[in-house]
């Protein structure tokens, strides 16, 4: 997965109400016990950085030593950096742990471009602001890399959540979650909540910022509006999901929805961009410039190369379209639709140069591995990763941004027949390549 | 504060080829595209090609047909481009420049000498 | 590829003066035009994005104007360190290219 991703919400702000928070609706649905309610010492526990990806605070060894780590659902290892690098300001000192236990294995995880390489071990970890719990994991201790550590990202290793078919070198090695939900009585599912600042950060503002939420065993109700709708997770390996058909402003795409799926779907919390496919974002590129076609906007920006900027407080949100992805529902034939706002596949960029201007990325690219549901749809929504009932929620979050006239929305239910069909099975080969 | 350092100067023979190369700070290296642009003695500007150096994507101006091949070195921050089969047309100041809108950031500029 | 054509190699102007250096696209480039000022032996140093934006720590004498294929940089009360070379550029499609710069002179 690549790192990446932006930030959150701050209160304060002059100028357009960039910021707005949506009222929590009534409705709730009934209780499911121990799974839904308040997880307040979990809540606001995610830091991160325009681009560069959400981080939680662990702790590793005895006595317990402090680390950020990457919340990564594109990947399955847990890996620290575990030898001085330019980029750490910190690293797990194993010599120091009377704890670690080593596996005496190595494991080398190669990149579309770079790598990290370790040693494998066991130590104790918690989460000092999640599940008041410690569990024995494996740790891939990273003594060697190249292209992983990004330079002032405050983060110094990586926490796969995805499935033990991704762990590297092999299935054999459980990734933590499986180590937290055996171990310990909390319950196969977390949530996260990726809150997009909507504007950029600098450094100390970064540090003194809020990110978002990663909820271990629950859902807290706190963190969305509206209701949870659910899409089969295809395959336990990466979190595989069914995109079943694409609008633009309400206009279909058109695509045979084999092509969404072209050779994945998943969604990722550690990619900032949402990724689609190089036809689908061939199509999804022409209908964007063609709704926004008021203004001329150069090649270079729907390359992600070229910025754009407008006047602090005058960015014309409106004439950016919405973009809905349907997903396949939990009821044969039935699926809903997810809606993300310019206001998250815009990123916003702070460049010295142009400070007196509000300037932004398109953070929608194209992929060779598939659609990658990054940064840009995760943080218009909580998203529920229920493991243990193979399923993936969305609800539209209670701290993405939006502006008075439109909101992220999650709604259904939608009629879709042969949704099956959508699904693309790739032919079974190795997957080597994680961060793609 | 954005720094793009360019060495001075560079004297090869006709035939031979060069490395240039563009080392940046003061930025996440990784976030926005490098840029590189010809200006021959007392002449205009020719944009040579650009490369994202979070995934090594580049695009070149054709019209140069092969003669540059751009490149990074993430772990130092250093964009590179490689000049082959030199000749005397290639003598010029060759710069590095950083994407935003347009282009905000340059470097000083190389100058290389194609001399027998 | 687009062409810029800076129609005037060289502008005569006094320092205190006003005057406008002249850029035109051989097809529509929307507002995305850049300016540069160089000094020679010296790299180009950033004046305006997007046809009328300074970028910042720019004089405001200098402003940008124009879209689509006719663009102008004024510099209203010259200066002696203005008296060096104006190029404009297109960043609307690839190849990006450059006009062939106007030198302003004192006359």
């Known amino acids: 997965t690549q790192h990446g991703i932006r930030l959150p919400l701050r209160s304060g702000l002059g100028g357009a109400p960039l910021g707005l928070r949506l009222p929590r609706e009534t409705d709730e649905e009934p209780e499911e016990p121990g799974r839904r309610g308040s997880f307040v010492e979990m809540v606001d526990n995610l830091r991160g950085k325009s681009g560069q990806g959400y981080y939680v605070e662990m702790t590793v060894g005895s006595p317990p030593q402090t680390l950020n780590i990457l919340v990564d659902t594109g990947s399955s290892n847990f890996a620290v950096g575990a030898a001085p690098h330019p980029f750490l300001h910190r690293y797990y000192q194993r010599q120091l742990s009377s704890t670690y236990r080593d596996l005496r294995k190595g494991v080398y995880v190669p990149y579309t471009q770079g790598k990290w390489e370790g040693e494998l071990g066991t130590d104790l970890v918690s989460i000092p602001h999640g599940p008041n719990v410690t569990v024995r994991a494996n740790i891939a201790a990273i003594t060697e890399s190249d292209k992983f550590f990004i330079n002032g990202s405050n983060w110094e290793g990586i926490l796969g959540l995805a499935y033990a078919e991704i762990a590297r070198p092999d299935d054999s090695l459980e990734p933590f979650f499986d180590s937290l939900v055996k171990q310990t009585h909390v319950p196969n599912l977390f949530s996260l909540q990726l809150c997009g600042a909507g504007f950029p950060l600098n450094q100390s503002e970064v540090l003194a910022s809020v990110g978002g939420s990663m909820i271990i065993g629950g859902i807290d109700h706190s963190l969305y509006t509206g209701s949870l709708w659910y899409t089969p997770i295809r395959r336990e390996w990466y979190y595989e999901v069914i995109i079943v058909r694409v609008e633009i402003n309400g206009q279909d795409l058109k695509m045979d929805c084999k092509e969404y799926n072209y050779d994945k779907s998943i969604v990722d919390s550690g990619t900032t961009n949402l990724r689609l496919p190089k036809k689908v974002f061939e199509a999804a590129v022409k209908s964007i410039k063609a709704a926004s076609s008021t203004e001329k906007f150069p090649d270079g920006f729907w390359l992600g190369e070229q910025l754009v900027c407008w006047q602090a407080g005058t960015t014309p949100w409106n004439i950016f379209p919405v973009i809905s992805l349907y997903l396949m529902g939990e009821v044969t034939n039935q699926s809903f639709r997810i809606t993300i706002l310019p206001q998250q596949y815009l990123r916003p960029v702070e460049d010295v140069a142009t400070s007196q201007d509000d300037c932004y990325k398109f953070a929608i690219s194209q992929s060779s591995t598939g659609t990658v549901m990054g940064a840009v749809i995760m943080e218009g929504f909580y998203v529920v990763f229920d493991r243990a009932r193979k399923r993936i929620g969305f609800a539209v979050s209670a701290c993405h941004v939006h502006d008075e006239f439109r909101t992220a929305a999650v709604e259904g239910p939608f009629v879709t027949l042969d949704m099956e069909d959508c699904g693309y099975n790739i032919p079974q080969t190795d997957e080597s390549t994680l961060m793609t | 504060e954005v720094q793009l350092q360019q060495p001075g100067a560079e004297v090869v023979r006709p035939g031979t080829s060069v490395k240039l190369s563009c080392k940046a700070s003061g930025y996440t290296f990784t976030n926005y595209w490098m840029h590189w642009v010809k200006q021959r003695p007392g002449q205009g500007l020719e944009w040579i090609g650009m490369?994202?150096?979070?995934?090594?994507?580049?695009k070149y101006n054709q019209k140069l047909k092969g003669k540059a091949t751009l490149t990074v070195d993430t772990s130092s921050s250093t964009a590179n481009m490689h000049v082959n089969s030199l000749t005397s047309e290639d003598s010029a100041v060759y710069f590095c420049?950083?994407?935003?809108?347009?282009?905000?950031?340059w470097g000083q500029g190389t100058l290389v000498t194609v001399s027998a | 590829d687009i062409l810029m054509t800076q129609s005037q190699k060289f502008m005569s102007t006094s320092v205190g003066d006003r005057v406008s250096v002249t850029c035109k696209a051989s097809q529509n480039v929307g507002r995305n035009v850049a300016w540069y000022q160089q000094i020679s032996g010296q790299s180009p140093k950033p004046l305006i994005y997007?046809?009328?934006h300074r970028y910042s720590g720019v004089p405001d004498r200098f402003t940008g104007s124009g879209s689509g294929t006719d663009f102008t940089l004024t510099i209203s009360n010259v200066q002696s360190e203005d008296l060096v070379e104006f190029f404009c550029?297109?960043?609307?499609?690839?190849?990006?290219?450059f006009g062939g710069g106007t030198k302003l002179e004192i006359k």
């Open positions: 997007s046809a009328s």
């Open positions: 550029q297109q960043y609307n499609s690839y190849p990006y290219t």
């Open positions: 490369i994202d150096p979070s995934d090594n994507y580049t």
């Open positions: 420049a950083r994407s935003g809108v347009a282009f905000p950031y």
